[in-house]
């Protein structure tokens, strides 16, 4: 056990590998294709370690003469990812990325899978349906979230630190109760941002502080009772 | 894991004093406040204060205060609540805890009469 | 000091039923606490610590919720071994104060 000026406690969510999908149901196919129009583009905040789906606009695959995913990831040349009915072959261009495929023969099904989401897949992901009666689109800014890891612990008296490790977006953190508190953000070069509350408190009755981290990915709490002040002894309350 | 092992029930009489003594284990003991708590038969839970034992300093709830000692040997890893100028009404159980209140011993009955 | 209102003080559940107590800390001040289960004769038992963490051990029908000043215990589906009394303690501010206690009983 670490000594208490120093105790630490930690948090980390562990994930089963979770699937996420925007894709719409068999049934919604049949709806007209304005309401498609209307929803070319979606943001989309996926955890990271998780399974992704993203799915074309719903058109029947017999209307269908090609379909491509186009793919901008950061620092990356643009890849696209071509299916042409007519032909039934398949064409990519500057894919690197072996997480990112077709969910199963394209013919069959037009969405597109990421396996185990990274941060290097934040990017557009765009699905582009060439029909007879016209070009349908949906595209998706997908937006890796990285679930920060929690710490607290004392490093002087009546003074706590919360800092929330490589979240992405950066976290928020609050107090109870609330102290005389400074935050500072690091950014990491992965996109990830490190949040680092340092708090004090200077009423003694103040037994014990809870640090609260926010995150998109769930939130957290934390707690610590502080230490006493050096040379006090005796205190009735 | 924690384990707060705490002395034996105890039978006092009215105006006298009684020592409560909770062995602590499986923490760092200096690093820790260590609280006192009291139930008294059929009612609630009443905190009677707290020690932490790296430096002896000390709170006590008001309504103790002139009557409770809370001490600490930090070579046995003990704690000791003394209370003093006993009465009736301080018949109850009496229980050490630790770890922000997650640690708990298994309570020493204090029976005080006549 | 910092009250704290626990309520309902006792009631009279079905097995099965959902159940519900609060507590809410006085003067408006943000606190957070603890919950406990408490049968005759034994010390009381840690369930959820710090408002929402279900401890090691304890079935998932125990939850807690809230934040600030109120808080919610839950029992989703109470159980005949549920029968006991159930208290939450402050433990941000000195001294630390507990609610009066709620007695549940299995009808």
């Known amino acids: 056990q670490p000594n208490n000026s120093l105790m630490l406690q930690t948090s980390k969510e562990n994930h089963a590998l979770a699937s996420s999908s925007l894709c719409m149901d068999e049934k919604q196919i049949t709806q007209n294709y304005s309401k498609v129009l209307a929803e070319v583009n979606t943001s989309w905040p996926v955890k990271m370690a998780t399974n992704a789906v993203l799915c074309c606009p719903p058109i029947a695959l017999r209307n269908l003469i090609i379909i491509t995913w186009e793919i901008i990831l950061r620092g990356q040349p643009s890849c696209t990812k071509a299916y042409k009915k007519e032909t039934n072959e398949t064409k990519e261009t500057n894919c690197t990325d072996e997480r990112i495929t077709w969910v199963s023969r394209p013919d069959q099904n037009s969405d597109l899978q990421i396996r185990t989401v990274a941060i290097t897949h934040d990017g557009y992901y765009r699905c582009i349906m060439v029909t007879p009666d016209g070009n349908f689109h949906r595209g998706y800014h997908l937006q890796v979230l990285v679930t920060p890891e929690v710490t607290l612990f004392q490093n002087r008296n009546r003074t706590a630190v919360c800092k929330a490790v490589a979240g992405k977006p950066a976290a928020h953190i609050s107090w109870i109760p609330e102290g005389d508190c400074a935050t500072k953000q690091e950014y990491w070069s992965n996109g990830t941002v490190t949040v680092k509350s340092t708090c004090h408190w200077e009423v003694h009755n103040v037994s014990t502080v809870t640090c609260h981290v926010s995150h998109l990915t769930g939130n957290k709490s934390l707690y610590i009772e502080l230490l006493p002040v050096p040379g006090a002894k005796k205190s009735a309350k | 894991q924690v384990q707060l092992v705490q002395s034996g029930a105890e039978v006092k009489k009215p105006g006298a004093s009684v020592k409560v003594s909770c062995k602590a284990s499986?923490?760092?003991?200096?690093?820790?406040?260590m609280h006192w708590v009291r139930q008294a038969p059929g009612q609630g839970l009443e905190w009677m204060g707290n020690?932490?034992?790296?430096?002896?300093?000390?709170n006590y709830d008001e309504k103790f205060q002139g009557r409770v000692t809370m001490t600490a040997d930090t070579s046995t890893s003990t704690v000791y609540m003394e209370l003093s100028s006993l009465r009736s009404e301080d018949t109850a159980v009496y229980y050490c805890?630790?770890?922000?209140?997650?640690?708990w011993g298994r309570g020493t009955l204090v029976t005080v009469s006549s | 000091d910092i009250q704290m209102t626990q309520s309902p003080s006792s009631l009279s559940v079905s097995v099965g039923d959902r159940v519900t107590i609060t507590c809410q800390a006085s003067q408006g001040t943000p606190i957070n606490l603890h919950w406990f289960q408490q049968k005759p004769g034994k010390a009381p038992k840690l369930l959820i610590s710090g408002a929402s963490n279900l401890e090691d051990g304890v079935p998932s029908r125990f939850s807690g919720s809230g934040s600030g000043t109120e808080f919610t215990f839950t029992i989703s589906s109470l159980q005949p071994e549920d029968a006991a009394t159930y208290y939450c303690?402050?433990?941000?501010?000195?001294?630390?104060?507990f609610g009066q206690g709620t007695k549940l009983e299995i009808k």
């Open positions: 805890l630790t770890m922000t209140g997650t640690s």
């Open positions: 020690i932490y034992p790296g430096s002896g300093s000390i």
């Open positions: 499986g923490h760092t003991f200096t690093s820790y406040w």
């Open positions: 303690l402050q433990f941000t501010y000195i001294p630390w104060t």
